[in-house]
């Protein structure tokens, strides 16, 4: 058993049918010694008397808010949550496995640049009685500070007969050095509590591996005289690290016909312009990627040819 926060405790339960459970001793936070009784949640049934209460925690029915009283007055509370292990594996029931980029991916994180700011998100089908707490650091043995905000509900979607809820959090490394080579990964830890169930989820990554630039901005077409060709130009996204001479991007320019089956013409360039043939009803799209490290491509920025 360990303390999650004041008066909230997590009981680690190795569960299997007929498991004996965990013996937990609760102590009433009071100088009083006599006349103390204990109850669970809203029930008036007295579970025991005395300054300490010993319980056997076998299942969620044994978790909840234990209260000690004296003469009708509440003395203190202890909320017991369960962290359940089955077959040697801690439960991961609260969050959905996103399966990208691999199985057992519960947290996904992205950074728009090298400033040390990043966003993580996760999915759940649970709509109520749900709280999250996020902590982060660089390295784990001698951790360096990363400050995370509160997790917020960022999207709701319907998936078949189910509703899915996306939560996200923004974090910022306290003393980020954008140009430095990373040697220690960022660690992100999410505590999830649903009703009386506690679970924790972790992710470990280097900022360079989660970089995904914003799409190029100010995408424009300039027709070339007496030609079907156009000059496409764009700019670095505002959110990308500066100076651009050091934090350079490479770009992919694509001409796509109206039909998805039509052949796509693609050009790769390090410049912020390219000359392409603009077909009728086609569209031109440009996306960006770090020039020197193969992290994710940005989403596409698009304009119609006409």
């Amino acid at each position: 058993i360990w303390e999650l926060k004041k008066d909230v405790y997590v009981v680690e339960l190795d569960w299997y049918p007929d498991a004996p459970g965990e013996m937990v001793v609760l102590t009433c936070d009071t100088p009083e010694e006599d006349g103390i009784t204990w109850t669970l949640d809203q029930s008036s049934e007295v579970l025991g008397s005395g300054k300490t209460l010993t319980i056997q925690v076998k299942e969620f029915g044994d978790a909840g808010q234990y209260t000690c009283h004296k003469g009708g007055e509440v003395l203190s509370h202890s909320l017991l949550l369960l962290h359940k292990k089955e077959d040697g594996i801690w439960s991961t029931d609260i969050l959905k496995d996103q399966k990208e980029p691999k199985n057992k991916t519960f947290l996904r994180c992205e950074a728009k640049n090298y400033s040390g700011r990043f966003t993580c998100w996760w999915l759940t089908t649970i709509s109520t009685d749900l709280t999250f707490s996020v902590k982060s650091s660089r390295g784990s043995s001698d951790p360096q500070g990363v400050t995370c905000g509160a997790a917020t509900l960022s999207a709701e979607r319907v998936r078949g007969d189910n509703k899915e809820y996306e939560y996200s959090v923004e974090c910022q490394e306290d003393s980020a050095c954008p140009a430095a080579e990373e040697s220690l990964p960022i660690e992100v830890m999410v505590d999830a509590v649903h009703k009386l169930k506690y679970e924790n989820y972790t992710s470990s990554f280097f900022i360079r591996d989660i970089i995904k630039p914003d799409p190029p901005k100010n995408l424009q077409l300039k027709p070339l005289k007496n030609s079907r060709q156009v000059e496409v130009s764009w700019e670095y996204p505002d959110t990308w690290s500066t100076p651009h001479s050091y934090f350079s991007l490479t770009f992919c320019v694509q001409v796509q016909g109206k039909s998805k089956r039509e052949k796509k013409d693609r050009v790769f360039t390090d410049k912020t312009s390219a000359t392409v043939i603009c077909r009728k009803n086609a569209s031109i799209s440009v996306r960006a990627q770090d020039r020197y490290y193969s992290s994710s491509w940005s989403e596409w920025a698009s304009v119609p040819c006409s």
């Epitope: 569960w15 299997y16 969620f60 029915g61 089955e86 089908t125 189910n162 649903h194 169930k197």
Partner: nanobody
Framework: EVQLVESGGGVVQAGESLRLSCAAS????????MGWFRQAPGTEREFVAT????????YYADSVKGRFTISRDSAKNTVYLQMSSLKPLDTAVYYC????????????????WGQGTQVTVSS
């Protein structure tokens, strides 16, 4: 919302068997732990059995252990309670419930409930 409809109740002799079914509709059945409870006249609702969302773990009340078996068929969105060696003490209305906490024998840990099906065991 999850809707639960129980069926399969009836009148049987002591020592006989009965299989209850609970059909779920609405939100994704596969996300929920499923349980059976029962209530005899003048008594509180009593836990019988529960099965986790994967169908890989079960948990029973001591009073039915070895006689009752809970199972689920995710393809059919149905949970079953196979009851054998029935006793007159098993007479009650049997309720199906869906929740997110496994294992739990406490009724308030379940979010959705069916209307119940009557089981009567005569001696």
């Amino acid at each position: 919302e999850v809707q639960l409809v129980e069926s399969g109740g009836g009148v049987v002799q002591a020592g006989e068997s009965l299989r209850l079914s609970c059909a779920a509709s609405g939100r994704s059945f596969s996300d929920y732990e499923m349980g059976w409870f029962r209530q005899a006249p003048g008594t509180e609702r009593e836990f019988v059995a529960t099965i986790n969302w994967r169908g890989s773990s079960t948990y029973y009340a001591d009073s039915v252990k070895g006689r009752f078996t809970i199972s689920r068929d995710s393809a059919k969105n149905t949970v079953y309670l196979q009851m054998s060696s029935l006793k007159p003490l098993d007479t009650a209305v049997y309720y199906c419930a869906a929740g997110r906490l496994f294992p739990s024998s406490r009724s308030r840990d379940y979010d959705y409930w069916g209307q119940g099906t009557q089981v009567t065991v005569s001696s």
